[in-house]
Interface confidence: low
């Protein structure tokens, strides 16, 4: 349905306060580096103008399409050529080229300060003072560091950020009651701004049909009640949403965000029996409550799949006539029987089957062909179940933090030329899958774990992609992306490293070590760790350990010691000098 | 809404005939193909018979083979089964899926085969 104004539309739509909150944030996400009191000088700029469009949708520009209206208000923004530099000539494009361009620009990793939380005090005061304000800027701070962020969610966020402001403000003990919620939300801000990346690294690298089938799998799963055209209705609704988001276009995306939490609480008899609690609550919370929503049971009487995707004579018949359709049912058919696979594992077997067929439906003797095409998955269901169950065995041997030590270990050697803070960032977040899912019943580790992995290991893409420095994770990255974890899992030391040369400069440590907390002071040590095995690659497990068990006694000696900085001066060399007879 | 809604069950003399509908609504009803499935009491299901988007191709299970006919029309929205010969052994709740599927979707019409 088309309207004479998109602005307006969209504005009596969603309503003030969450269309100026939407645009906000794609502001912030455009251009990452500007003062927040600029992109708040914008908003309330278009806010006005979209004012003008819903009184009278007949009023000069009000015709123009979104990109062209936010695209032109970007542009005004006079320190664009020194700030962004070659991003400024993305002005000179026309649309809907200029979005395209805007889009290229979003960093993954923009070159912003770590968020420092104030004292509690100050921010109970800074909220208290003016609130609208304070939340604007937790927009805004998140979404220029996180350019892919589910902007409708990021809402849903923000509401809770207020809410527990308001909350533990007035209260007793006022950070008892904020910093928890604050970590809470802080921890789970960053898993959701990494599953949405992997979606939108999906639908821009991979196209939407992967995207789609990504979809039919895991809404197969979460709903295997719901017959296969409704599963493909959602597949579709859902697919345009997150390539709206994903392509900057956030009032649409929310918009039809909203719509179809709508349509599934209407339909909930067709969809699942556990949509019932997350349709009463608000707009937010209920379409957050949707995306999360536990797996319904499964129909009790589902018959065996060979019947149709094996015994059938007419498998290549069915096949030919509606390829996409006729996979489409076979994946649906079976992750609907399977929340016990991972998502990538249920895409891989389809990708299997559709192989198979396309082999066999060109041979003398299909059905002959096909036949076993169900023991060839076996293979491709123990390789991520065995890898789920050794790892799941080390972390429970080792614990968090020396099991991330060991991928630490694994990857360095797998892939050395990765920058060292890149790689301990992603082994640190491949680590934390122990404690997220290995606790989990076995029917449901693999696919925590698995699709978990996908999630981290799309970070180190999008990193790699901005500056490549391994061909090895470039293939891997670029070839399949069902096939991404199983391909980093393959890889082996990479023997046509150079090892690095040692430099006593990044082994030398000073008494500021003793004042960080708990996790800095884990990824100083794992910095170094990093170093090592680029330095000596072939270094074996039990040398490294020996290396980082001295560095630990040597760190806790200089922080008991009355002259910090005098036993770090004087003991630091000594450990440098044992750690490389140790390694030679 | 997805729905799938079966009519033109009985109760009906052996050797007898009666003509099953499917209407359905809520999905592109001329880009699927569509299945027949029965399930007699105490039994799991059973599929009868499958006809392709376009009409042009159908499919039927051995036991009903010459005895049944699937049709259906896709400006209408509606799938057809059109019962002749029919047998006590036809006794069942008789039911339309999308596609090949033989998961239940929809209530059913109860066919009875006595005399």
């Known amino acids: 349905d088309t309207h004479k104004s998109e602005v307006a539309h969209r504005f009596k739509d969603l309503g003030e306060e969450h269309f100026k909150g939407l645009v906000l944030v794609a502001f912030s996400q455009y251009l990452q580096q500007c003062p927040f009191e600029e992109h708040v000088k914008l908003v309330n700029e278009v806010t006005e103008f979209a004012k003008t469009c819903v009184a009278d949708e007949s009023a000069e520009n009000c015709d123009k399409s979104l990109h062209t209206l936010f695209g032109d208000k970007l542009c005004t923004v006079a320190t664009l050529r020194e700030t962004y530099g070659e991003m400024a000539d993305c002005c000179a494009k026309q649309e809907p080229e200029r979005n395209e361009c805007f889009l290229q620009h979003k960093d993954d990793n923009p070159n912003l300060p770590p968020l420092v939380r104030p004292e509690v005090d100050v921010m109970c005061t800074a909220f208290h003072d003016n609130e609208a304000t304070f939340l604007k800027k937790y927009l805004y701070e998140v979404a220029r560091r996180h350019p892919y962020f589910y902007a409708p969610e990021l809402l849903f966020f923000a509401a809770r950020y207020k809410a527990a402001f308001a909350e533990c403000c007035q209260a007793a003990d006022k950070a008892a009651c904020l910093l928890p919620k604050l970590d809470e939300l802080r921890d789970e801000g960053k898993a959701s701004s990494a599953k949405q990346r992997l979606k939108c690294a999906s639908l821009q690298k991979f196209g939407d049909r992967a995207f789609k089938a990504w979809a039919v799998a895991r809404l197969s799963q979460k709903f295997p009640k719901a017959e296969f055209a409704e599963v493909s209705k959602l597949v579709t609704d859902l697919t345009k949403v997150h390539t709206e988001c994903c392509h900057g276009d956030l009032l649409e995306c929310a918009d039809d965000r909203a719509d179809l939490a709508k349509y599934m609480c209407e339909n909930q008899d067709s969809i699942s029996s556990k949509l019932k609690e997350c349709c009463d609550k608000p707009l937010l919370e209920k379409s957050h409550c949707l995306a999360e929503v536990e797996n319904d049971e499964m129909p009790a009487d589902l018959p065996s799949l060979a019947a149709d995707y094996v015994e059938s004579k007419d498998v290549c018949k069915n096949y030919a006539e509606a390829k996409d359709v006729f996979l489409g049912m076979f994946l649906y058919e079976y992750a609907r029987r399977h929340p016990d696979y991972s998502v990538m594992l249920l895409l891989r077997l389809a990708k299997a089957y559709e192989a198979t067929l396309e082999k066999c439906c060109a041979a003398a003797d299909p059905h002959e062909c096909y036949a076993k095409v169900f023991d060839e998955f076996q293979p491709l269901v123990e390789e991520p179940q065995n890898l789920v169950k050794q790892n799941c065995e080390l972390f429970e041997q080792l614990g968090e933090y020396k099991f991330q030590n060991a991928l630490l270990v694994r990857y360095t050697k797998k892939v050395p030329q990765v920058s060292t803070p890149t790689l301990v960032e992603v082994s640190r977040n491949l680590g934390k899958v122990g404690a997220k899912c290995c606790k989990l019943p076995e029917a449901k580790r693999m696919p925590c774990a698995e699709d978990y992995l996908s999630v981290v290991l799309n970070r180190l893409c999008v990193l790699h992609e901005k500056t490549p420095v391994s061909e090895k994770v470039t293939k891997c990255c670029t070839e399949s992306l069902v096939n991404r974890r199983p391909c980093f899992s393959a890889l082996e030391l990479d023997e046509a490293y150079v090892p690095k040369a040692f430099n006593a400069e990044t082994f030398t440590f000073h008494a500021d070590m003793c004042t960080l907390s708990e996790k800095e002071k884990q990824v100083k040590k794992q910095t170094a760790l990093v170093e090592l095995v680029k330095h000596k690659p072939k270094a074996t497990k039990e040398q490294l350990k020996g290396v980082m068990d001295n560095f630990a006694a040597f760190v806790e000696k200089c922080c008991k010691a009355d002259d910090k900085e005098a036993c770090f001066a004087e003991e630091g060399p000594k450990f440098v000098a044992a750690s490389q007879a140790a390694l030679a | 809404q997805v729905q799938l809604v079966e009519s033109g069950g009985g109760l009906v003399q052996p050797g007898g005939s009666l003509r099953l509908s499917c209407a359905a609504s809520g999905f592109t009803f001329g880009s699927f193909g569509m299945s027949w499935v029965r399930q007699a009491p105490g039994k799991g299901p059973e599929w009868v018979s499958a006809i392709d988007s376009g009409g042009t191709d159908t499919r039927y299970a051995e036991s009903i083979k010459g005895r049944f006919t699937i049709s259906r029309d896709n400006a209408k929205k509606t799938l057809y089964l059109q019962m002749n010969s029919l047998k006590p052994e036809d006794t069942a709740v008789y039911y339309c899926?999308?596609?090949?599927?033989?998961?239940?979707g929809s209530q059913g019409t109860q066919v009875t085969v006595s005399s």
């Open positions: 899926t999308i596609g090949q599927s033989t998961s239940r």
